[in-house]
Amino acid sequence: LQDPCSNCPAGTFCDNNRNQICSPCPPNSFSSAGGQRTCDICRQCKGVFRTRKECSSTSNAECDCTPGFHCLGAGCSMCEQDCKQGQELTKKGCKDCCFGTFNDQKRGICRPWTNCSLDGKSVLVNGTKERDVVCGPSPADLSPGASSVTPPAPAREPGHSPQ
């Protein structure tokens, strides 16, 4: 025998208290598929979360983060504070990237500069807190008198003069 609840469309639930009638989801609840026996409570975007898409009878609300924060986790389950480029978020707040590392985003951690010499290349543009090193052609590729290319950095490459 076919389950009578299978006829209940999205936006309704199969109400066992009422002879399995397909009752509309109450306000602030939804069912995104048919045949549901309950409606799910709508997500509420409060505090540091803000509403990106309102809840409806057939779909949950979607949240993003207020300015100065960014989403983390599936479906923006958390909001994390933004930092400036050249910084990373620590337990004590936003801290500048250490020498030899960079972060070109408002989120995430500082990453080490690329070590050009591992690929047999030279440093074309020095790294900063905000930008990675730009590697140039390998020294062997340099034609004589090609003075426009920065010479290989000293042994402590990647090179970044202290600020």
Partner: antibody
Framework: QLVESGGGLVQPGGSLRLSCAAS?????????PCWVRQAPGKGLEWIGC?????????YDANWTKGRFTISRDNSKNTVYLQMNSLRAEDTAVYFC?????????????WGPGTLVTVSS | DFQLTQSPSSLSASVGDRVTITCQAS??????LAWYQQKPGKPPKLLIY???TLASGVPSRFSGSGSGTDFTLTISSLQPEDFATYYC???????????FGTGTKVTVK
């Protein structure tokens, strides 16, 4: 907005089909079209509603069974009330209303109504 | 059958009065109750939904309360434009659950 049409004078035992055309929004799982009537000098009486999406689930007052049927044409964004075996006591203004999930399924939008008179 | 009973059926009041109308359901409907205002020759206007939420554009002098079987509509300070008939409605779908109340006519004292 909602606009009802199809009302008029009909003899007892006769039939009538009322229409309600919606504009500015579409019926959906969040907006159910409903019919309500009001006899002269009397209170409001709920007739029924129909699921606003593609399913044909209807919610009807018990007294309507066999005589009144609600249907919908989503392509025309129009809902209908088919009334059969009409009686003098069915004389009333018939309102079309939008029952909205966003308003706790309350009727947040109403048509002006169409008068149905059942008389010989 | 499910029923909603309003009281009083009519009342006379003056501008500035506090007016209270009650609505009793024959079985529990949680907070699924709406209140409407209707003036002669016009369709009803939604005032309150989910028992206590003010509908868009409705003045704050209107308020609703209650849950289960007993509900109240209050007009804190009656204004000239508030003389009308008021109806409660269960918005609990199915099994005849969407009945309207019997109505309360508010007239000038």
């Amino acid at each position: 907005q909602l606009v009802e049409s199809g009302g008029g004078l009909v003899q007892p035992g006769g039939s009538l089909r009322l229409s309600c055309a919606a504009s500015g929004f579409s019926f959906s799982a969040n907006y159910y079209p409903c019919w309500v009537r009001q006899a002269p000098g009397k209170g409001l009486e709920w007739i029924g509603c129909i699921y606003g999406g593609s399913s044909d689930i209807t919610y009807d007052a018990n007294w309507t069974k066999g005589r009144f049927t609600i249907s919908r044409d989503n392509s025309k964004n129009t809902v209908y009330l088919q009334m059969n075996s009409l009686r003098a006591e069915d004389t009333a203004v018939y309102f079309c209303a939008r029952s909205a999930w966003y308003s706790g399924w309350g009727g947040d939008l109403w048509g002006p109504g169409t008068l149905v008179t059942v008389s010989s | 059958d499910f029923q909603l009973t309003q009281s009083p059926s009519s009342l006379s009041a003056s501008v500035g009065d506090r007016v209270t109308i009650t609505c009793q359901a024959s079985q529990s409907i949680s907070n699924r109750l709406a209140w409407y205002q209707q003036k002669p020759g016009k369709p009803p206007k939604l005032l309150i939904y989910s028992a206590s939420t003010l509908a868009s554009g409705v003045p704050s002098r209107f308020s609703g309360s209650g849950s289960g079987t007993d509900f109240t509509l209050t007009i804190s300070s009656l204004q000239p434009e508030d003389f009308a008939t008021y109806y409660c409605q269960s918005t609990y779908y199915g099994n005849d659950g969407n009945a309207f109340g019997t109505g309360t006519k508010v007239t000038v004292k």
